[in-house]
Interface confidence: medium
């Protein structure tokens, strides 16, 4: 029974075998399922842990120690229990074949037996000795892991919270990245795509010259409209001529008509009589210049001055100086009226700003500016605003003081970068600032985490794209 | 009511081609990115294609295993959105969706494409 | 390109119960991910999106939740209209990619 020997079977077991004799007495002594082994994934983001990594590493392996020293146990009681049956059968043995003569070996036997018991007493006392010794060292280990726990806790908070620092300064940058990365590929496709393309450029002028034709009729139909109500107006003055008696206080039928049909602004097409919506013929003050604007004489009282529109992405804002100048897109649609209108119009008299915006899940907010003008193009457009009310944020999405304008080829803004290039679309940029309603036009459900979309910080956060949007301008006496 | 309705499914010999209809109503299908979804018989959903409008042009994207064998277009006086199959592989075969913007909240019924000798 | 992996591939389930169906992105897809509920011959319909936005008239026991790489559809009490194959998506970037599906199963 001393040739004993220790092994691994098939399944992972430790395995103990005892030779006695002609028999043979193998001990399979089980492994606790809890315990993972050190080859065995484990993957955690450290920063959302309760405790360090070397924490949870030390309670792993003081789990594998007690597993070890649970086995351990389990394997001595079993030795001990084995080696008292093997004494009983022994001593059964003597007794049963020993006669008077076989005394002294007997006693040999008995002696080896106790020699042999004492040996494994021995070493069970050494075994438990290095148990309790290593338990021992552990319980200091992990006690001295708990005491530093806190210390590490806390330093994972900080740097949880630098953490959360960093990645609002990358979220920008990553939303950067992707947009690269998006015309990255669309850069790849180019080639393959160039005959696709082509075809896609045929059909899209063809859709273009089909809105085109429909486009000229609604013109001609308004037209149509435009010259009857002119062709009334003209017979209402001539009628107003005829019945003044005095003929000093008569005047060039010619001049009266130009009088009535040239407006400034849609306040005062409304305050003319025209309280339809639609498009209007404006005229710049102090000039003969001329500029087509929609109206809207239903909301809020009328007389609104639309001066941008956005609702479909139809048209692109990623334009230059001169034609944020002048002005681009279809009045009937997406539109900017132009800023040299615009600054005219609003230096000559007082003007409040009205901005309309709509969400994709059907909301509308807006924010009214009591005061607004342009400034110059000698001073970039830069614009004014004071006293902010509505419904989109009580601070205003437009940086105060006002910025001057930028454009693709016109950066005017407070970046080291050009907003205008990285945001797409001219505005008046801060650094890059809190709105941008000339962005990129977004759809439904592809509308979020856009940072180069229609923007306006304060009522739906930075990386919110707009469903539609109008800027409307009107006399603040209206 | 939005509706999406697909047609123009059949079965075509292996190098054949086909081209795909979607006619669309309910909803600014100017302003929709619109998409070609398919899913083979028993298997998941695996997308094919996009057409989006970037302010006032149309841009495409195609899933790698299409890429220069199919087109997306489409004719905006028509409502409608085509997927032109060329050069037809028999791993092709499978029902083809229509649906907006994605993630897509609006999607057609399905036309079955068979590719087989 | 991102993949998208699903788990489980199936699961069984009684009416009543909770169920929650994972999926990870291989990258970071910010919060652009979808869930679709796909039943036998029929289209797709769209339940999630932003990863934890109800489309609307889906009912309140779908909720959706997860950003960056980690994502997950919970049906809080399964209904028997629920038996369905249900599929995650991310719309972040080229090429959209789906997960492999799930399909719930009557115990």
């Known amino acids: 029974y001393n040739n004993f020997r220790k092994s691994m079977d098939s399944i992972g077991k430790k395995q103990y075998q005892v030779q006695h004799g002609s028999c043979s007495y193998t001990f399979l002594l089980p492994e606790m399922d809890n315990c993972r082994s050190s080859s065995s994934p484990y993957v955690s983001n450290a920063v959302q842990r309760d405790a360090p990594l070397e924490y949870d590493d030390s309670v792993q392996r003081l789990q594998v120690l007690e597993n070890i020293m649970e086995n351990n146990t389990q394997w001595l009681m079993k030795l001990e229990n084995y080696i008292q049956d093997n004494m009983k059968k022994e001593m059964v043995e003597i007794q049963q074949n020993a006669v008077q003569n076989q005394t002294a070996v007997m006693i040999e036997i008995g002696t080896n037996l106790l020699n042999q018991t004492a040996e494994q007493t021995r070493k069970l006392t050494d075994v438990e000795a290095q148990v309790l010794n290593q338990t021992t060292r552990l319980e200091l280990q992990l006690l001295e892991h708990s005491l530093s726990t806190n210390k590490l806790e806390k330093q994972i908070l900080d740097q949880t919270s630098e953490i959360n620092k960093l990645q609002d300064k990358n979220s920008f940058l990553e939303k950067k990245v992707l947009a690269m990365e998006d015309k990255h590929i669309i850069q790849l496709q180019s080639i393959k795509e160039e005959k696709d393309q082509l075809q896609v450029l045929v059909s899209k002028q063809n859709s273009i010259i089909e809105e085109l034709e429909k486009k000229i009729v609604t013109a001609t139909v308004n037209n149509s409209v435009l010259q009857k109500q002119q062709h009334d107006l003209m017979e209402t003055v001539n009628n107003l001529l005829t019945m003044m008696s005095t003929s000093n206080s008569a005047k060039d039928p010619t001049v009266a008509k130009e009088e009535q049909i040239s407006f400034r602004d849609c306040a005062e097409v409304f305050k003319s009589g025209h309280t339809t919506n639609g498009i209007y013929t404006l005229t710049f003050p102090n000039s003969t210049e001329e500029i087509k604007a929609y109206c809207d004489m239903e909301a809020g009282g009328g007389g609104w001055t639309i001066i941008q529109r956005r609702e479909d992405g139809s048209v692109d804002f990623q334009r230059t100086w001169k034609e944020y100048k002048v002005g681009f897109g279809n009045p009937s649609g997406e539109y900017w009226l132009g800023n040299e209108f615009v600054s005219q119009l609003t230096n000559q008299q007082r003007y409040v700003l009205k901005i309309h915006l709509k969400d994709w899940e059907g909301n509308e907010a807006y924010s009214l500016y009591e005061h607004f003008y342009l400034s110059s193009e000698e001073l970039n457009y830069r614009i004014h605003l004071k006293g902010l009310t509505g419904t989109a944020g009580k601070i205003s999405s437009i940086s105060q003081p006002g910025n001057d304008f930028s454009t693709k080829d016109g950066d005017n803004d407070k970046c080291i970068c050009k907003c205008s290039q990285m945001l797409t679309g001219g505005w008046w940029f801060d650094a890059c600032g809190p709105s941008n309603l000339n962005g990129m036009y977004y759809p439904q459900r592809q509308n979020t985490n856009k940072f180069n979309g229609i923007k306006w910080y304060y009522w739906k956060g930075s990386g919110y794209s707009l469903k539609a949007t109008t800027m409307m301008i009107r006399p603040a006496d209206f | 009511e939005v509706q999406l309705v697909e047609s123009g499914g059949g079965l075509v010999k292996p190098g054949g081609s086909l081209r795909l209809s979607c006619a669309a109503s309910?909803?600014?299908?100017?302003?929709?990115?619109m998409n070609w979804v398919r899913q083979a018989p028993g298997k998941g959903l695996e997308w094919v294609a996009e057409?989006?409008?970037?302010?006032?042009?149309?841009?495409?994207h195609y899933a790698e295993s299409v890429k220069g064998r199919f087109t997306i277009s489409r004719d905006v006086s028509k409502n409608t959105v085509y997927l032109q199959m060329n050069s037809l592989k028999t791993e092709d075969t499978a029902v083809y969706y229509c649906?907006?913007?994605?993630?897509?909240?609006?999607w057609g019924q399905g036309t079955l494409v068979t590719v087989s000798s | 390109d991102i993949q998208m992996t699903q788990s489980p591939s199936s699961l069984s389930a009684s009416v009543g119960d909770r169920v929650t169906i994972t999926c990870k992105a291989s990258?970071?897809?910010?919060?652009?991910v979808a869930w679709y509920q796909q039943k036998p011959g029929k289209a797709p319909k769209l339940l999630i999106y932003?990863?934890?936005t109800r489309w609307t008239g889906v009912p309140s026991r779908f909720s959706g939740s997860g950003s960056g790489t980690d994502f997950t559809l919970t049906i809080s009490s399964l209904q028997p209209e629920d038996f369905a194959t249900y599929y995650c998506?991310?719309?972040?970037?080229?090429?959209?990619?789906f997960g492999g599906g799930t399909k719930v199963e009557i115990k």
């Open positions: 649906t907006d913007t994605q993630p897509g909240a609006y």
């Open positions: 998506q991310q719309t972040s970037s080229y090429p959209l990619t």
């Open positions: 932003w990863a934890s």
């Open positions: 990258q970071y897809v910010f919060t652009d």
């Open positions: 309910g909803f600014t299908f100017r302003a929709a990115w």
């Open positions: 057409i989006r409008l970037k302010s006032n042009h149309y841009e495409t």
